[in-house]
């Protein structure tokens, strides 16, 4: 008789990333008997929830159930019914909810309570919704990319899984940019740290890792823009803000109450003689860059070396994967290629920002104007953050790899979070079994 493959025992997991600007649901699958192997879990689906981030539902919590319906129903379709009850569901909320909690624990709790109630109505094994710490967000992002790059595997391969994988086991650093925060995580050369708050120790697959991580709350691209506007309106002579970070000819009215809604602008808050002001774009990269730099306080550092705002940062080491909004923005601007130097990126940004708004709208007719209008700022902000904030140089720029997916799985904290919560990253190297799940009988 012909050999027949044994049916694979497949497991699934769901993680919802409740970010500041939107929520995404990720479905992961893996062969059950290979749970402790490295690199076996992969993403089968991403479903982007329609609407803003959950923190924006504070005034309309009754709409949260409907908000989550489409993606949860999609999960119901993708995952075989027989697996529903044993499929764990986790929701992690990030900086948008950290900011809401900073303003009011009650409001943050209320949103999470309604989210939990909504997710409990599905046939999956709901494991809870919580606000993850900035440290966790950084650490899980680092775990995700290194897991997907095969950095934790002890087996050396003669082939490369992904373009930027080198055969050495040196881990990649992780650069994550969201709407409300940004994280930097890497293994520094020196094991000792001057700042215990930024130090993490892991033992993964039999190896010890001493990791540096920091999450800069309010330095995600959206909150950084609010900060910049709040800073610049302080010195405006009237209710018109001529802004170099927006294309020439661009105009937008901003409510002062919206500007001061977030704790991120608290340091710039002042009584203004108007309730609204108008942004008028002048599209000048250099001036925009200068304005962005004012958000980074580099004059004070209680350590041997700092990033900005007095936060310790050890010397950069090795290659870095830059994902989430780092990738989305740079990909839109067509600047993710390994061959594009930092000087070239700056040149392209100068050109892009100076293009008239009408021209930009015509060239990118399919892109929502709200997003389209902010790419000049976001691109400039990314350059400023990486170069002046994190101290990358024209030379070390080539060590930054803008990554969207690795082997079909999105780079981000969600996979690392699930691997940790399902105990799928063993501290010790698993003993290799003689037969794999695809053994023939």
């Amino acid at each position: 008789t012909q050999n027949k493959a044994l049916p694979e025992n497949i497991k699934y997991g769901i993680v919802l990333d409740a970010g500041s600007s939107h929520t995404s649901l990720y479905i992961y699958k893996w062969p059950a008997e290979k749970e402790n192997d490295t690199g076996v879990v992969h993403q089968v689906e991403e479903c982007r929830v329609k609407g803003p981030g959950i923190s924006k539902y504070v005034q309309k919590v009754n709409e949260i159930g409907i908000y989550l319906t489409d993606c949860m129903e999609r999960a119901r379709e993708v995952i075989p019914r027989s697996q529903h009850q044993e499929t764990p569901v986790y929701l992690g909320a990030t900086a948008g909810m950290r900011l809401l909690r900073m303003e009011s624990e009650e409001l943050a709790d209320r949103v999470l309570d309604v989210v939990e109630r909504s997710l409990s109505n599905y046939p999956f094994d709901f494991q809870g919704a919580r606000i993850i710490t900035g440290q966790e967000e950084g650490a899980y992002g680092w775990i995700t990319i290194n897991y997907l790059l095969g950095k934790f595997s002890q087996k050396t391969r003669w082939f490369s899984i992904v373009p930027y994988e080198t055969n050495n086991q040196e881990t990649f650093g992780a650069l994550d940019l969201g709407g409300a925060s940004t994280q930097i995580t890497f293994v520094p050369q020196n094991q000792t740290t001057e700042s215990p708050d930024n130090a993490l120790q892991f033992r993964l697959y039999g190896k010890d890792y001493n990791v540096y991580t920091h999450s800069f709350l309010c330095y995600g691209k959206d909150q950084a823009l609010w900060q910049k506007l709040a800073k610049d309106i302080q010195v405006a002579s009237n209710e018109i803000l001529r802004d170099p970070c927006f294309h020439p000819g661009y105009k937008k009215v901003v409510n002062v109450s919206d500007l001061y809604k977030t704790p991120c602008t608290k340091r710039f808050e002042m009584t203004l003689p108007f309730q609204q002001f108008e942004i008028q774009g002048i599209g000048n990269y250099q001036q925009c860059h200068q304005s962005v730099l004012e958000l980074f306080n580099t004059s004070y550092c209680p350590y041997s070396q700092c990033a900005f705002n007095g936060i310790f940062l050890p010397p950069l080491q090795g290659d870095f994967g830059a994902f989430s909004a780092f990738y989305f923005v740079m990909n839109f601007l067509n600047l993710t290629s390994e061959k594009v130097s930092q000087e070239k990126v700056t040149e392209m940004m100068k050109k892009f920002c100076s293009q008239p708004w009408e021209e930009i709208k015509t060239s990118y007719a399919g892109v929502k104007e709200k997003y389209l209008s902010e790419y000049c700022f976001s691109g400039t902000y990314i350059l400023s953050l990486l170069l002046q904030g994190y101290h990358f140089t024209a030379d070390s720029w080539e060590h930054i790899h803008f990554i969207g997916k690795i082997q079909g799985s999105d780079a981000g904290w969600t996979l690392g979070y699930m691997l940790n919560l399902t105990n799928m990253i063993p501290a010790e190297q698993p003993l290799s079994t003689p037969l794999s799940h695809s053994t023939y009988v």
Epitope: S104, E105, R110
Partner: antibody, heavy 116, light 111 residues
Framework: QVQLVQSGAEVKKPGASVKVSCKAS????????MHWVRQAPGQRLEWIGY????????TFNQKFKGRATITVDTSASTAYMELSSLRSEDTAVYYC?????????WGQGTLVTVSS | DIVMTQSPDSLAVSLGERATINCKAS??????????MYWFQQKPGQPPKLLIY???NQGSGVPDRFSGSGSGTDFTLTISSLQAEDVAVYYC?????????FGGGTKVEIK
């Protein structure tokens, strides 16, 4: 576990200034606001103001505006409240409390006595 | 400013009996479906301890005999069965609007 430890008691002359410190531990200092509340002998609790440790922005009770200053040293996870132009009615126990709107954790209190 | 008026000023209750304290706000302290109302217990020489948040939720480690109710402007703290260790001053507080304000306090004693 969350802890807020305040500096020791102070005796000040009228017209002088006092600076009280509050050292936080057991949580990410920049994730929560820090409030200051005082209680004069036999009186109700009185809210002074708060700071956003993340960026140093602060909000005050109008009654203390111009006289109270709240600052932070994030590297030391410490908040400070300075009250200037002291008068005898400022004699009170001064507390720091962590929270957005929920004051779940309080310092042990610092007695400030204003006397000539 | 929102004025918080507590009643009574003091209260003497027998051990094991129910104690009820009221707090009235000069305007509603509700927002987005949440009551920004809190109850604290303070013993001599100690900082206040959070008992109730959001009008009716128990603070962590707070015994079940403490409960809160109410919404809008009228709120109540109830101690279902008074224990000797409950002798203290109780304060209500609102954080709906700056300046955050406290009630004048209610002294609870054993009868």
């Amino acid at each position: 576990q969350v802890q807020l430890v305040q500096s020791g008691a102070e005796v000040k002359k009228p017209g002088a200034s006092v600076k009280v410190s509050c050292k936080a531990s057991g949580y990410t200092f920049t994730d929560y606001n820090m409030h200051w509340v005082r209680q004069a002998p036999g009186q109700r609790l009185e809210w002074i103001g708060y700071i956003v440790p993340l960026n140093g922005g602060s909000t005050f009770n109008q009654k203390f505006k111009g006289r109270a200053t709240i600052t932070v040293d994030t590297s030391a996870s410490t908040a400070y409240m300075e009250l200037s132009s002291l008068r005898s009615e400022d004699t009170a126990v001064y507390y720091c409390a962590r929270g957005g709107t929920r004051f779940a954790y309080w310092g042990q209190g610092t007695l400030v006595t204003v006397s000539s | 400013d929102i004025v918080m008026t507590q009643s009574p000023d003091s209260l003497a209750v027998s051990l094991g009996e129910r104690a009820t304290i009221n707090c009235k706000a000069s305007e509603s302290v509700d927002n987005f479906g949440v009551s920004f109302m809190y109850w604290f217990q303070q013993k001599p020489g100690q900082p206040p301890k959070l008992l109730i948040y959001g009008a009716s939720n128990q603070g962590s480690g707070v015994p079940d005999r403490f409960s809160g109710s109410g919404s809008g402007t009228d709120f109540t703290l109830t101690i279902s069965s008074l224990q000797a260790e409950d002798v203290a001053v109780y304060y209500c507080q609102q954080t709906k609007e700056v300046p955050y304000t406290f009630g004048g306090g209610t002294k609870v004693e054993i009868k």
